[in-house]
Interface confidence: low
């Protein structure tokens, strides 16, 4: 059973809360911290022992419209000699984020939140070896 | 993605861009995917640049729990299981969107917030600066 909406989670609901129609919530998409920048080490995607490439997916009915996905370049990892070592594995590291999806239905537009799984980069791991009896 | 063409008879009330404030359906698509990285894989232990996961919890945010990665070593783990300081463990960071209650404590009013999270670590060749 789903429990119906509750007045408030952790605190009493302030009197100043905006009215919201049932079944929906008010979302201000003016982003807090819009201009912060990722301060990752320079081009780690190329310097990593499990290097990766980036591709950008673009969807005008999604907010944000651009989502960047990483793909590991190799199955194995790059060793000190610059060669692929297939005794190790390059694996994707993933993170969930939220996007807002815009849906057109005739003359009306509706909005839906969606969880999206983003591949952020790759890391080199020791493989799990399954021994066959 | 596919842009659905607008019916030419629709009133021209919607801008090409997203409006600043929208009413959003309460149900989140794909909401129940696994959000605990400790359960989803053990890469954080098996990586040559292993990391620890720290729980960041904030009841005024959705999702209320976010896991932050912190690299265990400055160097990387070599084939012998020792830390090799000729290589560097570095965090992989990602900007993600979360919901922040605004005004605070209001049950159904949110604002998007961009936050920077360290998702895991990767082993890289260091940038060597030669001093003249």
């Amino acid at each position: 059973r789903k429990i119906p909406k509750v007045g408030h989670t952790f605190f009493q609901k302030p009197e100043s809360c905006p009215p919201v129609p049932g079944g929906s919530m008010k979302l201000d998409i003016g982003i807090i911290n819009e201009n912060q920048r990722v301060s990752m080490s320079r081009n780690i995607e190329s310097r990593s022992t499990s290097p990766w490439n980036y591709t950008v997916t673009w969807d005008p009915n999604r907010y944000p419209s651009e989502v960047v996905q990483a793909q590991c370049r190799n199955l194995g990892c790059i060793n000190a000699q610059g060669k692929e070592d297939i005794s190790m594995n390059s694996v994707p590291i993933q993170q969930e984020t939220l996007v807002v999806r815009r849906k057109h239905q005739g003359c009306s537009v509706s909005f839906q939140l969606e969880k999206v799984l983003v591949t952020v980069g790759c890391t080199c791991v020791t493989p799990v070896i399954h021994h066959v009896q | 993605g596919i842009t659905i063409p607008r019916n030419p008879g629709c009133p021209n009330s919607e801008d090409k861009n997203f409006p600043r404030t929208v009413m959003v359906n309460l149900n989140i698509h794909n909401r129940n995917t696994n959000t605990n990285p400790k359960r989803s894989s053990d890469y954080y232990n098996r990586s040559t640049s292993p990391w620890n996961l720290h729980r960041n919890e904030d009841p005024e945010r959705y999702p209320s729990v976010i896991w932050e990665a912190k690299c265990r070593h400055l160097g990387c783990i070599n084939a012998d299981g020792n830390v090799d300081y000729h290589m560097n463990s570095v965090p992989i960071q990602q900007e993600i969107l979360v919901l922040r209650r605004e005004p605070p404590h209001c049950p159904n009013s949110f604002r998007l917030e961009k936050i920077l999270v360290s998702v895991g670590c990767t082993c890289v060749t260091p940038i060597v600066h030669h001093v003249a």
Epitope: I3 | L26, Y62, P63, N108
Partner: nanobody, 119 residues
């Protein structure tokens, strides 16, 4: 299958005490914040109290602060609500619930236990 079973409700006089229990099964109890929610006759649901996974933090609605205490025993997969100095306005069906609170839907809740405060 997730199950939450409340018990401990009953008829009590104003100023009296009751201890509600909730037996949880079918999920890793120690991994979730847990909640008590109540519904008075003819009224909407009201969130009452929350306790974090390890029991280190508790939150209460203002009307029960200082009178109700939420606690948990992770070894027994059990949630409790100690209710003291009960008032007529505390009369309600009390539910225990688990789940992420956005947008204020709980994943699962029990069948409830009725608390009646009356002289």
């Amino acid at each position: 299958e997730v199950q939450l079973v409340e018990s401990g409700g009953g008829l009590v006089q104003p100023g009296g005490s009751l201890r509600l229990s909730c037996a949880a099964s079918g999920f890793t109890f120690s991994s979730y914040s847990m909640y008590w929610v109540r519904q008075a006759p003819g009224k909407g649901l009201e969130w009452v109290a929350e306790i974090r996974q390890d029991g280190s933090e508790q939150y209460y609605v203002d009307s029960v602060k200082g009178r109700f205490t939420i606690s948990r025993d992770n070894a027994k997969n059990s949630l409790y609500l100690q209710m003291n100095s009960l008032r007529a306005e505390d009369t309600a069906v009390y539910y225990c619930a688990k789940g992420e609170i956005l947008p204020l839907y709980f994943d699962y809740w029990g069948q409830g236990t009725l608390v009646t405060v009356s002289s």
